[in-house]
């Protein structure tokens, strides 16, 4: 028997009597910035060097007893998640701590920030392998610490951090909301969102997946052989830093984009209940709980996609909404959300020398969420192509006219109020799976790929009556990229990607007659690479 | 206060710096922008940071920050400087009153300024 | 209040091995980790190993490593240590005892301590080693 | 391993007498000491934990203090069911117990 948590990440594969998976993480440097630990406790006892970095504030309340136990309690316990020698996720992966939080669990974002900055340095004076940064903290939203964030994981450093204990939006809190880090929430024993007295996990779209964060047992600072069980999304992200050396390890030229798209592909998917969020945060956040993969190398040759959701535009008549990708990923498709049906569509737009996902709020609109669908494709060349709405009654189409081109997502934007009120359905014509196809008041967008050994197809699921959601899945082997609703369908609130599911949400069906526009057809573009693993050795 | 004579003799310096005069004005059509935690109660009032524009160099952090004391000296204020960065942000942390949030907001380089804030375990 | 009983004295010749059971009952014995402390005739108390059911892992002490070997079967709540290569010395009371757990709050988590406190013990087998 | 030193081995007292028993680590253990009482035929039983924590249902003559590799076990008036032998337990390191002081009726 091994802890639960422990069990729950380990494939069924690695699962023996004793929790010992391949090559415990052994050439990757982990620094946590914590709370002092106690490094000679015996699961950690010559796995962490502690640093000589201190930055932390007074203790509150004038008879604070700092008790060396008590200082050291976070910090011991998540380095014994992160590499302890019994109940560690990594178990040749070595450390560094840095205190940057007080006996009482405190911090501040300056210290942090000077924190981040002595890892640079010493990245810097001394390079070593692939470096995981685990920050087990939140505070309230701070634009410097998502930007020092994101100028380590720019110079190659993985940064993993706690989602937040808050029962609220991550995105208000950093560094989760920070995009570059890997942000964790918290579950349980039976992949449930974890409670914490009162509050409980963060959630939302700035969480990148959950991890076992309920009752992890670890090092307690009470004496050098002392077990302890706490809770909270530390011990979560310490499970995906843990996870991250062990990839690394596997495979040390890993980018940031790389393993945050295998860490996504090979969680556990829609395990977690999602009636615990609240309604309005379940679209946005990601039913997945880490995992290791199932083999340390050969995921090479997949296509790697994931959904990237923006920030709410916010109600304005113009208002807009972008989602991007990170610098190494492709836009492959670009769609959009309202959940009072009212936008104005979405399109793909070059911003910076990059593409990104903007969609339209329309009057009377709440507001919109653009979806980005965001992919690994090595040596790919892609582009946009669009078509202006069309003056014949037929609609408005585009298609991949560059030879090697492959469609990988469909987006219409329109600037009238209410695109589709009593127009009939506009059939795509069968056997052009290469065009983009929408209503003659629309702009038709395509996105056209080309990259070694990619072939797409496209896949519909259509139904006749009128129901809230309709959807379609790639099949095994290969990675959905796009995801559209058929044009005709007024009442359609919008299109996103789930893992390989398109789904296609409409309004309550009480409020749609079943007439033939009460017809949804969710459109999803399924694509393939089998020369990936051959196009990164090229790269290399 | 702790290491008051830290400070009067930061100050001297700052007052002596060949960098005793006004603030440039910033590169035109660009204004700092100031931030502050939303969550009132994790505040921390007094101390900021200083965020320069992306390209600074190290010395021009340094000429910033005593730029803001030798100025603030002038209008009669103690200021510290707690820490210069450089490696992942240019910029400096300064220990200040709040009245100089608008004077420093003025001050060539600048990029953004935030108060510094509380962060806690998980 | 968990209440640990154990098997019965045990006579047994130089060389051989005995097997020593512990049964916990009234508690939830996954929760708690057993160790086994032993005391020769008028001697003090000696620690040989323990085992945590959660972690499921055994640490021995270092005299009696190779020699000594503890498990737990979860389904019948019941710790095992066995001795091998006994010699005459090995005669002693073999006790089992139960790791106490206390519950904190930090953080604001519920915190569960499991540490070498021995707040419940068997009653004591005697093995007793002669030929 | 950590060796444990206990002082006196035996002392002879009567009852209402106060008593101290002393316990020195041969490294330090911040406060990660038990300390036990066994009667004769019996299995040890815990009174004192974390150094200075009282076991509850035990009486309040009993404390600890110490801490670091200086320990101390005090009765405060003895009474007749105190005879018997007490031991200190570390558990800094794996657990080794000192070898005991035996209270005895003078």
């Known amino acids: 028997s091994i802890p639960w948590n422990l069990e729950r990440i380990t494939p069924p594969r690695y699962r023996a009597d004793e929790y010992q998976p391949p090559d415990g993480g052994s050439l990757v440097e982990v620094y946590l910035l914590d709370t002092s630990i106690q490094s000679d406790h015996r699961e950690i006892e010559g796995r962490v060097m502690v640093t000589d970095f201190e930055n932390v504030p007074e203790e509150d309340g004038t008879r604070f007893h700092r008790q060396a136990s008590k200082c050291d309690s976070h910090g011991t316990h998540l380095a014994g998640v992160v590499s302890g020698r019994d109940a560690g996720v990594a178990k040749g992966a070595s450390m560094r701590s840095l205190r940057v939080l007080n006996c009482q669990g405190k911090g501040t974002v300056s210290g942090t920030l000077i924190g981040l900055e002595f890892i640079r340095k010493s990245q810097l004076v001394q390079p070593v392998g692939p470096l995981v940064v685990l920050l087990p903290l939140a505070g309230g939203y701070s634009r410097v610490l998502n930007a020092a964030c994101q100028r380590l994981a720019r110079a190659g450093v993985v940064l993993v951090t706690a989602a937040g204990n808050f029962r609220d939006d991550a995105c208000l809190y950093s560094p989760a909301s920070a995009p570059e880090v890997i942000t964790v929430g918290a579950t349980n024993a039976q992949d449930q969102p974890v409670t914490l007295g009162t509050l409980g996990t963060n959630f939302g779209r700035c969480v990148d997946l959950f991890a076992p964060g309920e009752d992890i047992i670890g090092a307690s600072s009470d004496c050098s052989t002392c077990f302890v069980s706490q809770s909270g999304t530390s011990q979560a992200a310490a499970h995906v830093a843990g996870i991250a050396a062990m990839m690394l390890s596997a495979e040390p030229e890993l980018t940031l984009a790389e393993l945050r798209q295998r860490l996504i592909h090979f969680s556990a998917k829609d395990v977690i209940n999602e009636a615990w969020f609240p309604e309005d945060q379940r679209v946005l956040t990601p039913n997945l709980v880490a995992a290791l993969p199932p083999s340390t190398h050969g995921a090479g040759w997949q296509l790697f996609c994931r959904t990237v959701w923006s920030a709410h535009s916010g109600p304005t008549r113009m208002a807009t909404a972008v989602a991007r990708c990170a610098p190494d990923e492709e836009l492959l498709s670009c769609s959009s959300f309202s959940r009072s049906g009212k936008r104005r569509g979405e399109r793909m737009e070059a911003q910076g020398g990059k593409l990104v996902c903007r969609a339209h709020n329309a009057f009377g609109g709440e507001g919109v969420y653009a979806i980005a669908r965001c992919c690994l494709l090595p040596q790919a060349n892609c582009s946009v192509h669009t078509a202006p709405p069309a003056e014949a009654s037929m609609g408005t189409r585009v298609h991949c006219h560059q030879q090697g081109h492959v469609l990988t997502g469909c987006s219409s934007h329109w600037e009238v109020e209410d695109l589709g009120t009593h127009k009939p359905p506009v059939l795509r014509p069968r056997g052009q799976p290469n065009q983009c196809v929408g209503h003659r008041e629309a702009s038709i967008h395509a996105s056209c790929c080309h990259a070694p050994g990619l072939e797409c197809k496209v896949k519909e699921h259509g139904i006749p009556a009128p129901q809230e959601q309709v959807t379609v899945a790639c099949e095994e082997g290969w990675t959905l990229t796009g995801c559209s609703a058929l044009p005709g369908t007024s009442h359609v609130l919008g299109a996103y990607a789930v893992d390989n599911t398109c789904v296609v949400r409409s309004r309550d069906v009480s409020t749609t007659g079943s007439t033939s526009e009460g017809a949804v057809t969710a459109v999803a573009i399924c694509c393939r690479s089998r020369h990936l693993a051959q196009a990164s050795q090229e790269l290399q | 206060q702790e290491d008051e004579d830290g400070d009067y003799e930061e100050l001297v310096l700052a007052l002596r710096s060949e960098e005793d005069g006004l603030a440039e004005a910033p590169e035109h059509g660009t204004t700092a922008t100031f931030h502050r935690c939303a969550k009132d109660p994790w505040r921390l009032p007094g101390t900021y940071v200083v965020v320069l524009k992306e390209e600074t160099h190290l010395s021009q952090s340094e000429r910033t920050a005593r730029r803001l004391q030798a100025q603030a000296a002038r209008r009669g204020y103690l200021t510290k400087i707690l820490h210069v960065f450089h490696g992942l942000l240019p910029g400096f942390l300064v220990k200040m009153s709040g009245d100089l949030l608008e004077l420093a907001l003025k001050l060539p380089h600048v990029d953004y300024i935030e108060e510094d804030s509380s962060v806690f375990a998980q | 209040q968990v209440q640990l009983v154990q098997s019965g004295a045990e006579v047994k010749k130089p060389g051989s091995s005995v097997k020593v059971s512990c049964k916990a009952s009234?508690?939830?014995?996954?929760?708690?980790?057993i160790s086994w402390v032993r005391q020769a005739p008028g001697q003090g108390l000696e620690w040989m190993g323990g085992?945590?059911?959660?972690?499921?892992?055994?640490n021995y002490a270092q005299k009696f490593q190779g020699r000594v070997t503890i498990t737990a079967d979860e389904s019948t709540s019941t710790a095992y240590m066995e001795l091998s290569s006994l010699r005459s010395e090995d005669t002693a009371v073999y006790y089992c005892?139960?790791?106490?757990?206390?519950?904190?709050?930090?953080?604001?988590?519920?915190?569960?301590?499991?540490?070498?406190?021995?707040?419940?013990w068997g009653q004591g087998t005697l093995v007793t080693v002669s030929s | 391993d950590i060796q444990m030193t206990q002082s006196p081995s035996s002392l002879s007292a009567s009852v209402g007498d106060r008593v101290t028993i002393t316990c020195r680590a041969s490294?330090?253990?911040?406060?990660?000491l038990n300390w036990y009482q066994q009667k004769p035929g019996k299995a040890p039983k815990l009174l004192i934990y974390?150094?200075?924590t009282l076991q509850s249902g035990v009486p309040s003559r009993f404390s600890g203090s110490g801490s670091g590799t200086d320990f101390t076990l005090t009765i405060s008036s003895l009474q007749p069911e105190d005879f018997a032998v007490y031991y200190c337990?570390?558990?800094?390191?794996?657990?080794?117990f000192g070898q005991g002081t035996k209270v005895e009726i003078k």
């Open positions: 337990q570390q558990f800094d390191g794996d657990p080794t």
């Open positions: 009234g508690g939830t014995f996954n929760s708690h980790a």
């Open positions: 490294q330090g253990i911040r406060s990660a």
């Open positions: 974390q150094g200075s």
């Open positions: 005892a139960r790791h106490y757990e206390i519950q904190i709050g930090r953080y604001g988590m519920n915190v569960y301590y499991l540490m070498y406190r021995f707040a419940s």
């Open positions: 085992i945590n059911p959660i972690l499921g892992i055994a």
